[in-house]
């Protein structure tokens, strides 16, 4: 049938965390910082006054198919997308007196995956090819985690999957799915 030439247009079996979009405004926690808090001045110890758990680290369900080349999972998988603000944004007055939000330069708390779960999926392929079994690693819970600049990148990139890794004796497939395409796909989850 000539399907070897199929463009690898698949949803990444697990997308990079950095490819998740910011949630739309209506999904943000309704709890907003009081603009008059601390008289408009930043607190001396921004993370001492409020427990980090008070800030919004949302777990949003996202349903998608696992695809690999021309093959698609028989059923979609549902995983969590971690979203939201961890830790207070600080308020500084600008030159003309209106408030301005900015992120603290101290410890960086991020809403990121906390636990993962493995799920076996069956990939159905064209041309009468036998179904393929794949194990995917899906986000099971989210948490506000304190990240230092030192381990920032390694934490955020900890998002691999057995299915995404090339198997022995097989050439790895090119990752044709762009971050932009993944973002569009994820935006529909909300």
């Amino acid at each position: 049938q000539g399907w070897q030439a199929f463009k690898n247009d698949a949803t990444e079996i697990i997308p990079e965390l950095g490819e998740y979009p910011e949630p739309p405004p209506e999904l943000e926690n309704n709890k907003t910082m009081n603009r008059a808090e601390n008289g408009g001045r930043p607190p001396h110890h921004p993370f001492e006054t409020k427990d980090v758990s008070e800030y919004s680290c949302r777990e949003l369900h996202f349903t998608r198919y696992v695809t690999d080349g021309p093959c698609r999972s028989a059923k979609p998988v549902t995983e969590l997308v971690c979203s939201g603000q961890c830790g207070p944004a600080r308020l500084l007055p600008n030159a003309i007196g209106r408030g301005k939000w900015w992120r603290p330069s101290g410890p960086d708390f991020r809403c990121i995956p906390d636990r993962y779960r493995a799920q076996r999926v069956q990939l159905l392929c064209p041309g009468g090819e036998a179904p393929r079994a794949r194990k995917v690693r899906l986000v099971a819970s989210c948490k506000c985690k304190r990240l230092t600049r030192f381990h920032n990148q390694s934490e955020l990139k900890d998002f691999g999957t057995e299915a995404a890794r090339p198997q022995k004796g097989r050439k790895p497939r090119p990752r044709a799915r762009s971050a932009k395409a993944n973002q569009a796909e994820l935006e529909n989850a909300y």
Epitope: W3, F6, K7, D9, T11, H61, T63, R64, Y65, T67, P70, C71, R72, A74, K75, P76, T78, L124, P126, G127, A184, E185, L186, E187, N188, A189
Partner: antibody
């Protein structure tokens, strides 16, 4: 005999929420994905969304926020949150052809239920 | 994303003739395509799934083919009962989708 049937369609005024119900017989809902599709008078088929489980629900981009799909052990509901005149259509409920595979042909379909939104 | 375009919008065919309906996907959908027949006042009826597999109880006069972005439904030995509107439906992706169905093709039998 496996069948699905929609109910709840009626004349409503704009902004009045309306819930349509799809009742199934001859098969277990837990084994299948269920879909909602609508068809405005004289127009084509328009996909609204589907439900696989309580957490696995997906909507067409235009339907997000306008519709809510939920299910019980024997029924699938479609809530039109704030109907407008553009939501006037026949609403169909359909099941996956094969319980093991979603979005792989819908069969059976219900006969449809007509929703008219008018002031 | 994954928009489905059907051509022609309407076609006339004589009894006994052959009619071909095309469906084009804006992005490759492998073989995840179904075809439906709908008559006025009735729900759609599944004809073909996975691009070329005939649904249960459907006449072998209906034939589906295609892969990737280009698909075809061919009806041979057309009968009066084939007068209907035909729709294609993609089954590859559920995210960022406006509609999984094509716009429909009306088949008029003379």
């Amino acid at each position: 005999c496996q069948s699905v049937e929609e109910s709840g369609g009626r004349l409503v005024t704009p902004g009045t929420p309306l819930t349509l119900t799809c009742t199934v017989s001859g098969f277990s809902l837990s084994s299948y994905s269920m879909y909602w599709v609508r068809q405005a008078p004289g127009k084509g088929l328009e996909y609204i969304g589907f439900i696989l489980s309580a957490t696995a629900v997906s909507y067409a981009t235009w339907a997000k926020g306008r519709f809510t799909i939920s299910r019980t052990s024997t029924t699938v509901d479609l809530k039109i949150t704030s109907p407008t005149t553009e939501d006037t259509a026949t609403y169909f409920c359909a099941r996956d052809r094969d319980g093991g595979t979603t979005l792989d042909g819908f069969d059976p379909w219900g006969p449809g239920t007509l929703v008219t939104v008018s002031s | 994303a994954y928009d489905m375009t059907q051509t022609p919008a309407s076609v006339e065919v004589a009894v006994g003739g052959t009619v071909t309906i095309k469906c084009q996907a804006s992005e490759s959908i492998s073989t995840w395509l179904a075809w439906y027949q709908q008559k006025p006042g009735q729900p759609p009826k599944l004809l073909i799934y996975r691009a070329s597999t005939l649904a249960s109880g459907v006449s072998s006069r209906f034939k589906g083919s295609g892969y990737g972005t280009q698909f075809t439904l061919t009806i041979s030995g057309v009968e009066c009962a084939d007068a209907a509107t035909y729709y294609c439906q993609q089954g590859w992706n559920i995210n960022n989708i406006d509609n999984i169905f094509g716009g429909g093709t009306e088949v008029v039998v003379k």
